[in-house]
């Protein structure tokens, strides 16, 4: 069956060094346990996280995300997942694309991460 993929409409904000969560879901909601689910970064499609055949595929990850990501799957039975990125870096800022693939049918949603410096301040004039 066909579905749409839905992610945040507005940029998600995170501080350098913190963790951030990027939610994504399919509509209408349905069990996505047997689907391939992942995040990549355009424009070069670097794999941030990949879930396939019921498990996380760590070997496919881009090196800069290895050991820093976790797919929260508690609600995957309803078609809802969240990518957690730990130890956020300035280089994480920008676009991310979440996708769900069911056999040959794939849909995706783009989202944006804004990364801010927790120690930034403006000196008094």
């Amino acid at each position: 069956g066909q579905f749409r993929v839905i992610g945040p409409r507005h940029p998600i904000r995170a501080l350098v060094g913190d963790e951030v969560e990027l939610p994504c879901r399919i509509s209408p909601g349905k069990n996505a346990t047997g689907m391939e689910v992942g995040w990549y970064r355009p424009p070069f499609s670097r794999v941030v996280h990949l879930y396939r055949n019921g498990k996380d595929q760590d070997g496919d990850q881009a090196p800069e995300y290895r050991g820093r990501t976790e797919l929260l799957k508690d609600a995957i039975g309803e078609g809802k997942v969240t990518l957690r990125i730990r130890n956020v870096r300035f280089s994480d800022e920008g676009g991310f694309t979440c996708f769900f693939r069911d056999h040959s049918y794939q849909e995706e949603a783009a989202m944006e991460l804004k990364v801010e410096d927790p120690f930034y301040w403006v000196s008094p004039g």
Epitope: R4, R9, E21, C24, R25, P28, D74, A75
Partner: antibody, heavy 119, light 107 residues
């Protein structure tokens, strides 16, 4: 099955404070964002506040900003709303409701707890 | 803040008739729109999400349509238990906002 049970409402004088609680069960609490929505007697629904699943991000309606504080204890599966500097116009039934990551509607609601602000 | 406007405020119909409720957003909410039903003394219940999908356990007589700024909830054949207040809500932008409600009453 999913259950949300609010408590902590009551009669309070203007300027007073209360702490509302929402006990959650039947789902992985930390995976869901949580919201408070209120309804004044005979009126419509007004979103009040939201908090992310981890508790790291909070959001407020302008009408309560600086007076209300939302928080959660994921180890106790409980959502809170600290309400301070209460005004007569805060009189309402306060509902907790869950959503997924701020990208979903409110699919489950509690039964509500009544807050009455009157001298 | 996105303002949601529902019409009509009150709709008087008889069981078996078709009900059409409207909701308009002050700016595009894409398909991030839900419809809720509320009966006296009860919490709201989710009926429709993402503008057109029925929530779990909702009868097929309820349907939603629209995208962008204009949305419709249709109840194809009213049952006695359908008489209640209906709210639309956008959840695409914080603050999440509700319409003022449409009261569906028995004629």
């Amino acid at each position: 099955q999913v259950q949300l049970v609010e408590s902590g409402g009551g009669l309070v004088q203007p300027g007073g404070s209360l702490r509302l609680s929402c006990a959650a069960s039947g789902f992985t609490f930390s995976s869901y964002a949580m919201n408070w929505v209120r309804q004044a007697p005979g009126k419509g629904l007004e979103w009040v506040s939201a908090i992310s699943g981890s508790g790291g991000s909070t959001y407020y309606a302008d009408s309560v900003k600086g007076r209300f504080t939302i928080s959660r204890d994921n180890s106790k599966n409980t959502l809170y709303l600290q309400v301070n500097s209460l005004r007569a116009e805060d009189t309402a039934v306060y509902y907790c409701a869950r959503d997924y990551g701020g990208i979903s509607p409110f699919d489950y609601w509690g039964q509500g707890t009544l807050v009455t602000v009157s001298s | 803040e996105i303002v949601m406007t529902q019409s009509p405020a009150t709709l008087s119909l008889s069981p078996g008739e078709r009900a059409t409720l409207s909701c308009r957003a002050s700016q595009s909410v894409s398909s991030y729109l839900a419809w809720y039903q509320q009966k006296p003394g009860q919490a709201p219940r989710l009926l429709i999400y993402d503008a057109s999908n029925r929530a779990t356990g909702i009868p097929a007589r309820f349907s939603g349509s629209g995208s962008g700024t204009d949305f419709t909830l249709t109840i194809s054949r009213l049952e006695p238990e359908d008489f209640a207040v209906y709210y639309c809500q956008q959840y695409g932008s914080s603050p999440y906002t509700f319409g003022q409600g449409t009261r569906l009453e028995i004629k």
